[in-house]
Interface confidence: medium
């Protein structure tokens, strides 16, 4: 398989609601019609798959119904959003892109986006 460059931001801070968004951009060497995007989380040298979607160029990304990810595509960019994050989910989130069809097959893996998640402070009790 052929290597392909994938770019993603180095650092992203999740919102107070536990939502983090980042762009994954790949340098497509050809006109792919079928693309697969996988988000991997690396923490303590362990790599786990967070979510994945296969899409046809020009169509929306479709993640599984119970996925914590959503996304949109525009050309060679994929806008990924991960929801429901908590402080314990802080880690390096790696974007993996595969150009599935037509052949040849290309594989690209980004350097990862460090997502920092800070659990919101509980609201203090109010007298009012």
């Amino acid at each position: 398989c052929k290597a392909m460059h994938v770019a993603q931001p180095a650092v992203v801070l999740a919102s107070s609601r536990g939502i983090a968004s980042f762009v994954c951009e790949y340098a497509s060497p050809g006109k792919a019609t079928e693309v697969r995007v996988t988000v991997l989380r690396q923490a303590d040298s362990q790599v786990t798959e967070v979510c994945a979607a296969t899409y046809m160029m020009g169509n929306e990304l479709t993640f599984l119904d119970d996925s914590i990810c959503t996304g949109t595509s525009s050309g060679n960019q994929v806008n990924l959003t991960i929801q429901g994050l908590r402080a314990m989910d802080t880690g390096l989130y790696i974007c993996k892109v595969e150009l599935m069809y037509p052949p040849p097959y290309y594989l690209g893996i980004g350097n990862g986006t460090q997502i920092y998640v800070i659990d919101p402070e509980p609201c203090p009790d109010s007298d009012f």
């Epitope: 398989c1 050809g30 079928e34 697969r36 994945a52 296969t54 046809m56 595969e98 599935m100 069809y101 037509p102 052949p103 040849p104 097959y105």
Partner: antibody, heavy 121, light 107 residues
């Protein structure tokens, strides 16, 4: 061990229909990283790619010669691949092979034994 | 569509001979070419992919080379079980097409 076993071939009249099956074992048809497809070989002739279906999704692809007449599908629960052949013509007479197509190589690494489809009146 | 032309269409050789089959693509396919062996009444068997990568379990007497439009399959020392028909197939764009085949017969 990877195995592919085709069935469903036979004699059919021009304009008729047939459904070919390919039972897979030793790997999952829905596994990412591999597609599966059909290749045919007319008697005494060479090989012709017919159709393929992706492993991750269910994206389908066809050769122009069969587009609109043939339909590829799979049943993940049965780990079986199908090819529905409609509006058959004499030139569709061939041995139909199902084969596995790893994306990393895009070459057919495992083949079934083939099933003969004869279109004749 | 990319056309693949194999030469020769057939050849006669003896056990122990060095055999070379060529495959020419109508346009460049980089190194995205595979070779198959087919014996009568049997399914094809993958020998080489990506022009020169030997498929697991295939004897080392088989080798492939080439890039762009011109490719070669070489059998360094022909064995009795090698008498068969050989096909090339590109994997660069679609449709995936095959060469017309080269039949290797016993001299």
């Amino acid at each position: 061990e990877v195995q592919l076993v085709e069935s469903g071939g036979g004699l059919v009249q021009p304009g008729g229909s047939l459904r070919l099956s390919c039972a897979a074992s030793g790997f999952s048809l829905s596994t990412g990283g591999v597609a599966v497809g059909w290749i045919r070989q007319a008697p005494g002739k060479g090989l012709e790619w017919v159709s393929a279906i992706s492993g991750y999704g269910s994206t389908t692809y066809y050769a122009d010669s069969v587009k609109g007449r043939f339909t590829i599908s799979r049943d993940n629960s049965k780990n079986t691949l199908y090819l529905q052949l409609n509006s058959l013509r004499a030139e569709d007479t061939a041995v139909y092979y199902c084969a596995r197509l790893p994306y990393s190589a895009y070459a057919f690494d495992y083949w079934g034994q083939g099933t003969l489809v004869t279109v004749s009146s | 569509d990319i056309q693949l032309t194999q030469s020769p269409s057939s050849l006669s050789a003896s056990v122990g001979d060095r055999v070379t089959i060529t495959c020419r693509a109508s346009q460049g396919v980089s190194s995205y070419l595979a070779w198959y062996q087919q014996k009568p009444g049997k399914a094809p068997k993958l020998l080489i992919y990506a022009a020169s990568t030997l498929q697991s379990g295939v004897p080392s007497r088989f080798s492939g080379s080439g890039s762009g439009t011109d490719f070669t399959l070489t059998i360094s020392s022909l064995q009795p079980e090698d008498f068969a028909t050989y096909y090339c197939q590109h994997h660069y764009g679609t449709p995936l097409t095959f060469g017309q085949g080269t039949k290797v017969e016993i001299k």
